[in-house]
């Protein structure tokens, strides 16, 4: 197979014919050294998936349900290119499956038993697979056959295409369960009409259905969406209140050696030459031979799927949960309203050991999952492999953009017993220099910098945000002569000062000696000119408070703070000499797990929090000899957030604005994936 050939998998004679036409037309517009198309014909999409996994083909376009099959072992395929719909300016690559109800009804998602339901059709994504998959474990046993369990769960339904003889309740609201538009309650508009007419109490449809059927906002205001957290939202808040986000149609490839760049190059060229309204002789998004061949006829173009986005992230936790429930038919033994153990995400082996110790002391109420970077941990929480972790504000922002919510805040200044209910204002992000140097905020260019990690608040977002507004470009590695900013590109000058050891050099975890607050300060002590840290870092690591060899003889008076007005002050005066106020670190979780995480952590801190005095012979949650493992060591307690329960409210408008501005300089692959 030529190096630059993309073997496209076709699943019918008509598709194979279109594929050959695609191949020939691409040959005529691409240079001879450019990508080319080869066609492979298989009997079904599942056969195509297997062929790609076996390296007999390279690409195929799939619906969401098949993307799930493609991702499962042993196939291990991943999404590489998405079809988009709508306009180029506002491309839609996903739709949202929603549960619509009338505003004057008073039930929530967990109160659907005994209600009347309207569905688009049996086996369809938004109308059946997703809602029934998510409700699966609430269905009465036996859950097989599924139609019977659903019929016994709702008091009456319209499920077009269901068997009305075997399951009459499923056709109670639409006699015969007609499988075409002859049934007035068929498909999206039909299911909505079923609700609108008062036949049903809830309609399972797409987010766009309401807008397509009710042009008038006043009419739409008579309806609401049911959210998975048992609240309701208005119909235009579907992004924050849906059953699942469903990818429309996606090109998949192998996860390893999958030619994704080549596939993108090919499809990008293809849409330029043969996309919507581009060419008379060949159209990518239509065909004289049939409907939706190779690509959907309704597609307007392609978007490259960000490289960090694997199939789990692409399909989303809710969608995977729903499909897995339906396919595997397994439910937890515990009732769903009971809290299962919370899986904490630990960064590399130091945190994992502390987490294991916590797990033992919690009698298994805490379990541990590991990842090598904070972003990998956030991704694990998103997809359900982990449940929670405590994050610096910069990562609370990324986690929030990825759909996670803050649950509890670390408090550093409030003494018990008021701590748990106090909302602290935050800590100060400061720039620390040696007293012996002549540095000021205005002459940092060309100096050696030490950062906690890329993307963190005090170590990166605040100082680099201020710097950006001064220099108006993102080339921070050119501004400083060298530095250590864990998480930077390995060949960057901002990895040059890092200490490693070798394979972990510049990694954003505790294996890198200059990682985190203590690490950045150590970098200043040993190699750097300026360290960007929290205001407590110097006092916590001087005067013998840190027994490590590099720190045990350090004196607080040998360090000073840089003020934004060009002056310097003692490290005792952060309130009058700081870069900005930073939001405290906070625990984040998925929305569905937030209540359990909060309840469990409040209980755990009562046992292992700052009330424990002897940490040498007892487990202490907020202690790790200045290494800030799992939580900052200066945490007094984890505090309730009250109404600051979204990332925007928690971080505050000013900080969110600052980080959003800095996104032009973002090196976060996860953020790119979550904003796709």
């Amino acid at each position: 197979v030529p190096e630059k050939s993309v073997r496209w998998c076709a699943v019918s004679e008509h598709e194979a014919t279109k594929c050959q036409s695609f191949r020939d037309h691409m040959k005529s517009v691409l240079p001879s050294n450019g990508p080319s198309v080869a066609c492979v014909k298989k009997a079904s999409h599942l056969d195509c998936i297997r062929a790609i996994a076996a390296n007999e083909a390279d690409a195929v376009t799939l619906d969401a349900g098949l993307v799930y099959d493609a991702y499962l072992a042993p196939n291990n395929l991943k999404p590489v290119v998405a079809e988009f719909y709508g306009s180029k300016e506002d491309p839609q690559t996903f739709y949202y499956a929603v549960a619509v109800v009338k505003k004057d009804s008073d039930f929530q998602m967990n109160q659907l038993r005994g209600r009347k339901s309207c569905h688009t059709g049996l086996g369809r994504s938004a109308g059946w697979n997703i809602p029934i998959g998510l409700l699966y474990c609430d269905l009465p046993e036996p859950r097989k056959p599924l139609e019977k369990a659903v019929a016994n769960f709702f008091s009456g339904s319209c499920v077009p295409c269901a068997d009305g003889t075997d399951f009459p309740q499923l056709c109670q609201l639409c006699p015969g369960c007609g499988c075409s538009t002859l049934n007035q309650y068929f498909s999206y508009s039909g299911a909505f009409k079923c609700l609108k007419d008062g036949a049903g109490d809830v309609a399972f449809v797409k987010h766009s259905t309401i807008f397509e059927n009710l042009a008038n906002k006043a009419d739409r205001d008579q309806y609401e969406l049911l959210c998975l957290d048992n609240t309701r939202k208005s119909v235009d808040e579907y992004k924050d209140c849906h059953l699942a986000r469903v990818p429309s149609h996606t090109v998949v490839a192998r996860s390893v050696g999958g030619k994704e760049d080549l596939i993108w190059e090919l499809l990008n060229q293809a849409q330029e030459h043969f996309g919507k309204d581009k060419s008379k002789e060949f159209q990518l998004f239509s065909s004289p031979h049939g409907k939706d061949l190779l690509f959907k006829d309704s597609a307007h173009g392609f978007l490259k799927v960000p490289p960090r986005m694997d199939a789990k992230m692409y399909l989303g936790y809710e969608y995977i949960t729903a499909i897995r429930n339906l396919r595997e038919g397994t439910c937890p033994e515990a009732p769903t309203d009971e809290c299962k153990p919370v899986k904490w995400c630990a960064l590399s082996h130091h945190e994992r050991l502390k987490c294991d110790e916590w797990s033992v002391n919690s009698a298994g109420k805490i379990e541990c999952e590991s990842a090598e970077t904070t972003e990998d941990c956030i991704a694990k929480i998103m997809n359900g492999e982990a449940d929670a972790m405590s994050l610096d504000g910069g990562f609370v922002y990324i986690a929030g953009m990825c759909g996670l919510v803050p649950v509890l805040a670390e408090n550093y200044n409030t003494p018990n017993p008021n701590c748990e209910n106090t909302a602290e204002e935050g800590y100060f992000a400061v720039a620390v220099v040696k007293s012996s140097s002549d540095l000021t905020w205005d002459n940092l260019k060309g100096k050696k910098s030490c950062h906690t990690a890329v993307g963190r608040t005090a170590g990166w977002n605040i100082p680099m945000g201020l710097l950006y507004s001064k220099i108006n470009h993102c080339r921070f590695d050119e501004f400083f002569s060298e530095g250590c900013a864990p998480g930077s590109e390995k060949n960057s000058s901002l990895c040059k000062l890092c200490m490693g050891p070798s394979p972990n050099l510049c990694e954003p975890n505790n294996k890198e000696g200059y990682y985190g607050y203590t690490g950045a300060f150590r970098c200043l002590v040993e190699k750097g000119d300026v360290a960007f840290v929290k205001h407590q870092t110097v006092p916590q690591n001087t005067g013998g408070k840190n027994p490590d060899a590099w720190a045990k003889n350090l004196k607080e008076e040998d360090y000073e703070l840089l003020c934004l007005d060009g002056s310097r002050k003692s490290v005792q005066e952060p309130a009058n000499c700081h870069l900005a106020r930073a939001p405290n670190h906070a625990v984040v979780a998925r929305k569905d797990k937030a209540d359990c995480v909060q309840t469990l952590l409040l209980d755990q801190q009562r046992m292992f929090g700052s009330s424990v005095t002897d940490c040498s012979s007892n487990f202490c949650l907020f202690e790790s000899k200045t290494k800030d493992l799992l939580f900052r060591d200066d945490t007094v307690c984890l505090a309730k957030l009250h109404d600051r329960n979204t990332y925007e409210k928690y971080l505050g408008e000013e900080y969110v604005k600052a980080v959003t501005n800095l996104r032009k300089c973002s090196t976060s692959p996860l953020l790119e994936a979550c904003t796709f």
């Epitope: 130091h350 050991l353 110790e357 033992v360 002391n361 012979s617 290494k627």
Partner: nanobody, 117 residues
Framework: QVQLVESGGGLVQPGGSLRLSCAAS????????MAWYRQAPGKQRELVAG???????NYRDSVKGRFTISRDNAKNTMYLQMNSLKPEDTAVYYC???????????WGQGTQVTVSS
């Protein structure tokens, strides 16, 4: 820092039993938490069982009901009684006291357990 030495491993048939010991060179009385880990070839080291100073225990799901962890503070020793052994229990077993957890990635030699017919 307390030095720990593991012993008691060996070759055993599926369904058989072994008792591992972990002897400490100093007093373990004041150590908050002790644990057994294991590492199979090509796999990550994983927590098998742990015991707190007060004697409460915790086990990974796959060994619950088969393994029992205990500690004898007077003898400065921790034990792992392993019954109904399975081939998937084959690994090198290590004990740790967590006391030096934040400074060193220190592990002893471990003791090899092989379950095979």
């Amino acid at each position: 820092q307390v030095q720990l030495v593991e012993s008691g491993g060996g070759l055993v048939q599926p369904g058989g039993s072994l008792r591992l010991s972990c002897a400490a060179s100093g007093s373990i009385f004041s150590i908050a938490t002790m644990a057994w880990y294991r590492q199979a070839p090509g796999k990550q080291r994983e927590l098998v069982a742990g015991i707190t100073r007060s004697g409460s225990t915790n086990y990974r799901d796959s060994v619950k009901g088969r393994f029992t962890i205990s500690r004898d503070n007077a003898k400065n020793t921790m034990y792992l009684q392993m019954n109904s052994l399975k081939p998937e229990d084959t690994a090198v077993y290590y004990c740790t006291d967590y006391s030096s957890r934040y400074y060193h990635d220190y592990w002893g030699q471990g003791t090899q357990v092989t379950v095979s017919s």
